[in-house]
């Protein structure tokens, strides 16, 4: 995970009342105990700050030490600051925990920019606003880092929720969620509702605000509207999926679908942007520029560098197109599409112009490591990581930012042939040559 581009975390706007339960769609499988319904104690358990990550409160050790931990579906290590650092208000003090066990093994994680390194151990871990359980989990105690912690972000560690295959130093280090499922009766599933406010928040607003929900072990119906649509997890390492078609304002980009997944497509809560392979990014930007051609913006804006500002309340959302990603469905030759608005892919930025302005960065960027469906995508949807059934579900989030004319959408089914051909098969490489990070 590279923290140069972190996700925007802003307060949720509304949503269904907690008591409201939407009727189950007729095409859904029968309910299973513990998988669906109300998870009141876990709703609204995420917080954060624009561009700096969604975090959950966790406790580590005995007696419990409370830390805020970044929720990251793009990595697989549970790692926490364990030494003083200028950007940390607090850190994990192993010597104060009677249940800490040293694994006598180091771990070093380099990123495209920056790195962290530390010492491996295990300790007792729980999530106060999560399931009422305590588990013994692997912990990387970060003793040294560079460009990893973010000044003012208010989190002190990272919870990697992906699979063991990408854990460091190797896949023998069991990730937290695997430990949780093994040691408790928590179902092998979690779901995320990341709520973007649509406007920047200052530090005090962030601390008082809701950033979303991480529902561990189930699905909460109050967090979404309409139906959940599922796409298969192609391979259990990252949360890899297959994109079969891309449209800008309904216009097909008309690329070989392999390009959309070159060299993979992943769902990653630890990345701010929607990141696209070079060829796809260029085609998408060309199409977005054409759709919004009544106004022109500098190249630096499309590179995600420059901010564009409008007088407060006058952002011309209507000139920017919607973006649809078609994902492989669970049924042969069937796909569904998720559609995001400019309210998701234009990221509000604080403290730059005057208070009379609304300023934004373009939050779609180029990738050399495949498509990354970061917060730009996830803030539009309630996303179910159904590990038990090796699938990821998408439904329209009850807290997504929209206007009176358009809304994010999850729609299907669509007939799409030869979807398996859209997946890219990465040549086997010596693991030491793989580059970690999300630049």
């Amino acid at each position: 995970t590279q923290h140069g581009i972190r996700l925007p975390l802003r307060s949720g706007l509304g949503g269904a009342p907690l008591g409201l339960r939407l009727p189950r769609e007729t095409d859904e499988e029968p309910e299973e105990p513990g998988r669906r319904g109300s998870f009141v104690e876990m709703v609204d358990n995420l917080r954060g700050k624009s561009g700096q990550g969604y975090y959950v409160e966790m406790t580590v050790g005995s007696p419990p030490q409370t830390l805020n931990i970044l929720v990251d579906t793009g990595s697989s290590n549970f790692a926490v600051g364990a030494a003083p650092h200028p950007f940390l208000h607090r850190y994990y003090q192993r010597q104060l925990s009677s249940t800490y066990r040293d694994l006598r093994k180091g771990v070093y994680v380099p990123y495209t920019q920056g790195k962290w390194e530390g010492e491996l151990g295990t300790d007792l871990v729980s999530i106060p606003h999560g399931p009422n359980v305590t588990v013994r989990a692997n912990i990387a105690a970060i003793t040294e880092s560079d460009k990893f912690f973010i000044n003012g972000s208010n989190w002190e560690g990272i919870l990697g929720l992906a699979y063991a295959e990408i854990a460091r130093p190797d896949d023998s280090l069991e990730p937290f969620f695997d430990s949780l499922v093994k040691q408790t009766h928590v179902p092998n599933l979690f779901s995320l509702q990341l709520c973007g406010a649509g406007f920047p928040l200052n530090q005090s607003e962030v601390l008082a605000s809701v950033g979303g929900s991480m529902i561990i072990g189930g699905i909460d119906h109050s967090l979404y509207t309409g139906s959940l649509w599922y796409t298969p997890i192609r391979r259990e390492w990252y949360y890899e999926v297959i994109i079969v078609r891309v449209e800008i304002n309904g216009q097909d980009l008309k690329m070989d679908c392999k390009e959309y997944n070159y060299d993979k497509s992943i769902v990653d809560s630890g990345t701010t942007n929607l990141r696209l392979p070079k060829k796809v990014f260029e085609a998408a930007v060309k199409s977005i520029k054409a759709a919004s051609s009544t106004e022109k913006f500098p190249d630096g804006f499309w590179l995600g560098e420059q901010l564009v500002c409008w007088q407060a309340g006058t952002t011309p959302w209507n000139i920017f197109p919607v973006i649809s990603l078609y994902l492989m469905g669970e049924v042969t030759n069937q796909s569904f599409r998720i559609t995001i608005l400019p309210q998701q892919y234009l990221r509000p930025v604080e403290d730059v112009a005057t208070s009379q302005d609304d300023c934004y960065k373009f939050a779609i960027s180029q990738s050399s490591t495949g498509t990354v469906m970061g917060a730009v995508i996830m803030e539009g949807f309630y996303v179910v990581f159904d590990r038990a059934r090796k699938r990821i579900g998408f439904a329209v989030s009850a807290c997504h930012v929209h206007d009176e004319f358009r809304t994010a959408a999850v729609e299907g089914p669509f007939v799409t042939l030869d979807m398996e051909d859209c997946g890219y098969n990465i040549p086997q490489t010596d693991e030491s040559t793989l580059m970690t990070g999300r630049a």
Epitope: E295, G300, L307, C309, D351, C359
Partner: antibody
Amino acid sequence: QLQLQESGPGLVKPSETLSLTCTVSGGSISSSSYYWGWIRQPPGKGLEWIGNIYYSGSTYYNPSLKSRVTISVDTSKNQFSLKLSSVTAADTAVYYCARLGHGYNYFDLWGRGTLVTVSS
Amino acid sequence: EIVLTQSPATLSLSPGERATLSCRASQSVSSYLAWFQQKPGQAPRLLIYDASNRATGIPARFSGSGSGTDFTLTISSLEPEDFAVYYCQQVYVWPPRTFGGGTKVEIK
């Protein structure tokens, strides 16, 4: 080569509307490569951006002047114009029109400027 | 709002000397900064864009450097025609709006 020339009255009474026109010669105002803008400079002071316009009519204004400013474009005449309402002595300045080039980022070509005095 | 502070306000030098002008932004503007020269009774002229690129027709004695918050305009050897007021402008926040207060380079 492309040139810009401001024109309009040099004296405006307080509370009235200042009106200036910038004529583009030697090139088309309808070029998709440029925005066109107005900048002013009170006597002996620094530069203040007023606003920009694209040939399609899309405008951006300085928030501090927004309520009083209108910039418009007339592609048939290859001109763009500035109107500033309810003027006071503080609006006395040299007014420049300019081209926003280099990828819509930098004022790379300027008119010679015209002094507008607000006085009764 | 991003504020650009130029220093010194006045620089008194002789022809042939090296001039170093500073522009500091209140927060990072990456490399999105320009330098303009303005002579009395004339319109400003673009000298440098993107912090270090010389505009068309600008002599090589003018150079720009810096990124983030600190920027420098250097005139390696002052010519008589270089005595003027110099302004910086940031375009990190678009549309371009913020100019610095200016530095006057005068003959000593």
